[in-house]
Interface confidence: low
């Protein structure tokens, strides 16, 4: 019966939506009006009132109804007078919602639309800090970045001020993220003040002023390790060959190296003249795979290059006269040992392959058993799932969700009307071929507490807080380990390049460039992402959606964060925060049923709520037409 009611609501909503222009809430022909107190954009967590006043010819409304994202609200509605009603929300936490109201008129079979409005909640911006400007050699640009602070959830813009200290000339730029300023436009000498204003509908903040000298912020052209050779001597030594195209005369460099099995880097420092290829000697253990990276800075200056691509070299077991090897660069600009999962073999020995194979067989068997149990016993499957997840290796369920057999996906594929063609937020891209996963750190300048011999663990060393970004746009998606992260845009360092081989060429990134609340220590990953707004399916019927996912989440219970696996699939590149307590908003892809569980799973997370895109009503319009059929 409950399902029938919900579907009947949907049919009513369908009729209402048919009576609108096809352009979302801003184009509604209203028969009355709807307004929000205190405002349509308000601080997250506030109590708000939504008022609806009917002005329909020949209609004294029997009842006034409110809908949020296409779902009828049933509580906290007060009738104020014959034509007006109020809907009250306590502690409203959704970043975006589309509201509309309808009237039940006598002698009318269906509800009549009164009006609609998009509402948004969020926070005023923090004071931008850690303003950093660098010039990557040969780039022709000064790249300025800053720490935007906490998530605002609403459109936040930044005005970057660049003022010459010599001519007093000031230029201002509007951006949503970082900024590249052509050095040709910096004609007011060498010394500048740079500061950033952050502004949104809820407030405005201004950073401290950063004083820069153009000669002091140049980062030399990237240093690259080209090859390695091990020479048989009394004590075998390994020579690493490396070079840079820099024209800067005085350059200081660091090379760090470690056995791939180690967590600790050793660091060697060099004063370098790049008129010829550099050779650095190392005395290494035999028969061990080592990884090397190099980075440089103009001597005495502030900013370092990002670390170069990981360069691998395995020392020979019994040393021949000369062993020369130009080992592959598994990734670019990485601070971590690479997990390179290719369509071919993993770069590990045979024992690793056998382990992987065994794990996959065990997983397949368990999955079959689970599926059978899931079909026959709904209550049993939820209980056993958690215990199984504790037993199986984390990598088996961690980062690669598969929607191939999901009924939701099948339903969506069969009914393409569900997808809103002009909606960038709702793109269905099912089952891409995952060829590899790469984890990459994007470091910036040398920390002040940096030691010559770095003995700290890999994860906590050498990765300063501010990363410098460039023009590549990437999209955030939720991450399994941190529980949840919304979608946003972000940018990669100028000095960083995708690998020369064809590994990553299939990634054409064209998301919007308009939103960024950048976090610290980003790691670049290629991830699957199922970027369909689940909240818009959810409103159809609890049975329709949650029933399909009942193996993963029983309606009345909460499960571990891997519930997201079944909700995301699209090959995407993303930057992701290390810290679980940092989330980066712009678009949530989870329905509230899931979200309530995530809060329990990770207590450090701030309150997380479903994001409803501005054009959600249009997707409801499309989706509900399916019911009519």
């Amino acid at each position: 019966m409950n399902q029938v009611t919900i579907q009947w609501d949907a049919v009513i909503a369908l009729y209402i939506l048919f009576s609108w222009c096809h352009g979302g809430i801003t184009n509604i022909n209203c028969s009355g009006h709807i307004w929000v107190e205190p405002a349509t954009i308000f601080k997250m967590g506030m109590n708000i009132s939504i008022y609806c006043q009917a002005a329909i010819k020949n209609c004294q409304p029997r009842k006034l109804h409110f809908y949020k994202n296409g779902i009828k609200e049933r509580f906290q509605i007060t009738r104020i007078n014959k034509t007006t009603a109020r809907l009250w929300y306590k502690n409203f936490l959704e970043p975006h919602a589309s509201m509309y109201c309808t009237a039940e008129c006598p002698k009318h079979f269906q509800e009549t639309l009164i009006c609609g409005k998009d509402i948004s909640s969020g926070y005023p911006p923090d004071i931008p800090d850690e303003v950093t400007c660098v010039i990557y050699e040969y780039s022709g640009n000064m790249t300025c970045t800053w720490n935007a602070g906490k998530l605002t959830y609403i459109d936040t813009k930044y005005v970057v001020h660049v003022k010459s200290l010599e001519t007093e000339e000031e230029q201002q730029y509007l951006t949503s993220s970082y900024i590249n300023i052509s050095t040709d436009s910096l004609q007011g000498g060498k010394k500048y003040l740079v500061w950033v204003q952050a502004a949104n509908a809820l407030g405005m903040e201004e950073s401290k002023q950063l004083q820069i000298h153009l000669d002091d912020i140049v980062i030399p052209s990237a240093a690259v390790i080209s090859r390695a050779e091990t020479i048989n001597a009394t004590v075998p030594k390994t020579i690493i060959y490396w070079d840079s195209q820099t024209t800067i005369e005085k350059v200081s460099c660091e090379m760090r190296y470690k056995a791939t099995t180690n967590q600790t880097w050793n660091v060697k420092e060099f004063d370098t003249n790049f008129t010829y290829v550099q050779q650095s000697e190392f005395y290494l253990e035999p028969n061990i795979k080592y990884v090397f990276q190099v980075r440089c800075q103009e001597t005495g200056k502030r900013y370092w290059q990002p670390w170069s691509s990981l360069f691998f070299h395995k020392t020979p077991e019994t040393v021949p006269q000369v062993t020369s090897k130009a080992f592959q660069h598994d990734t670019w600009n990485s601070g971590l040992t690479v997990a390179s999962i290719s369509t071919g073999h993993l770069t590990s020995d045979n024992r690793g392959d056998i382990g992987l194979l065994l794990g996959m067989i065990v997983f397949a068997v368990m999955l079959s058993i689970l599926s059978l149990i899931g079909i026959f016993n709904r209550s049993f499957r939820t209980g056993i799932k958690r215990r199984i997840l504790l037993l199986i290796p984390k990598w088996l369920y961690e980062d690669i969700p598969n929607m191939k057999n999901s009924n939701v996906v099948k339903m969506l594929q069969e009914n393409s009307e569900l997808m809103n063609n002009n909606s960038s937020e709702q793109v269905l891209y099912v089952d891409p071929m995952i060829t590899e996963i790469k984890e990459i750190f994007i470091p910036e300048h040398k920390p002040t507490d940096y030691k010559k011999e770095n003995t700290g663990p890999l994860e906590t060393r050498d990765y300063p807080q501010n990363s410098l970004f460039d023009n590549t746009t990437v999209v955030y998606i939720p991450d399994l380990n941190t529980g949840y992260k919304p979608q946003i845009s972000n940018f990669l360092p100028e000095g960083s390049h995708l690998s020369n081989n064809n590994e990553i060429t299939s990634l054409t990134l064209k998301p919007p460039v308009d939103s960024l609340d950048s976090g610290n220590n980003p790691r670049l990953q290629k991830h699957p992402n199922f970027a369909f707004s689940v909240s818009s399916v959810n409103s159809l019927s609890n049975t329709i959606f949650l029933g399909e996912l009942s193996l993963i989440l029983n309606q009345g219970e909460c499960s571990s964060p891997d519930i997201q696996n079944s909700v995301e699939e699209e090959t995407t590149m993303l930057l992701e925060n290390d810290s679980p307590s940092e989330t980066i908003p712009e678009q949530t892809l989870l329905p509230d049923e899931f979200v309530s569980c995530l809060g329990i799973v990770n207590e450090e997370l701030p309150s997380i709520n479903t994001y409803f895109p501005q054009n959600i009503l249009e997707s409801h319009f499309n989706r509900i037409s399916l019911l009519e059929k």
């Epitope: 000339e169 730029y173 951006t175 590249n180 004609q187 023009n471």
Partner: antibody, heavy 128, light 107 residues
């Protein structure tokens, strides 16, 4: 099509204040700088100050500092210029002008402080 | 503040003739200079910005040149509607300043 519509003519007494409004339509109001320029009868153009509506960042010519206040209301896409302690030499046509559009360079907008859209002008007469 | 001096104050020419207007800055303004046209009873109209870029919808007969302190607006062949007052404006430094104007009148 972008339009800037200014409030009507004003006659003021010396020592009083005047507040002129400028309502923008047909474009994104908050992303462009709005400036106020005045022109005394038979004279040239004089820049008084400007504001970036999204940030509220305002800049004033030294000559008017302390006497002029420029504000913007994003919700109504309206900019305001208030001039206080009026004197007879403040009699002029006051124009609001919007920053040059098409200033998008990659991800950002450069604030040009050249003006490609102007209001129709508001004549403020200061007379005792 | 930067003072912009326009010359001549008045230019008397016939339709079809070439008009050359000059604007000199008291200190370098790089290429941050614009030209406007104003007709009686109307608001100014942007012609050229950043010394030499024509604004949208401005005919090709209008061109700008110069950098540093000396700038020129050239109207290659005067049309009847080109007779007006022309102002230069710099945005290199606060405050923004305008020249005093050059009136182009029909001879």
């Amino acid at each position: 099509q972008v339009q800037l519509v200014q409030s009507g003519a004003e006659v003021k007494k010396p020592g009083s204040s005047v507040k002129v409004s400028c309502k923008a339509s047909g474009g994104t109001f908050d992303s462009y700088a709005i400036s106020w320029v005045r022109q005394a009868p038979g004279q040239g153009l004089e820049w008084m100050g400007g504001i970036i509506p999204i940030s509220g960042y305002a800049n004033y010519a030294q000559k008017f500092q302390g006497r002029v206040t420029i504000t913007a209301d994003e919700s109504t896409s309206t900019a305001y210029m208030e001039l206080s302690s009026l004197r007879s030499e403040d009699t002029a046509v006051y124009y609001c002008a919007r920053d040059l559009s098409g200033g998008y360079l990659g991800l950002r907008t450069l604030y040009y402080y050249y003006f490609d859209y102007w209001g129709q002008g508001t004549l403020v007469t200061v007379s005792s | 503040e930067i003072v912009l001096t326009q010359s001549p104050a008045t230019l008397s020419l016939s339709p079809g003739e070439r008009a050359t207007l000059s604007c000199r800055a008291s200190q370098s303004v790089s290429s941050y200079l614009a030209w406007y046209q104003q007709k009686p009873g109307q608001a100014p109209r942007l012609l050229i910005y950043d010394a030499s870029n024509r604004a949208t919808g401005i005919p090709a007969r209008f061109s700008g040149s110069g950098s540093g302190t000396d700038f020129t607006l050239t109207i290659s062949s005067l049309e009847p509607e080109d007779f007006a007052v022309y102002y230069c404006q710099q945005r290199s430094n606060w405050p923004l300043t305008f020249g005093q104007g050059t009136k182009v009148e029909i001879k």
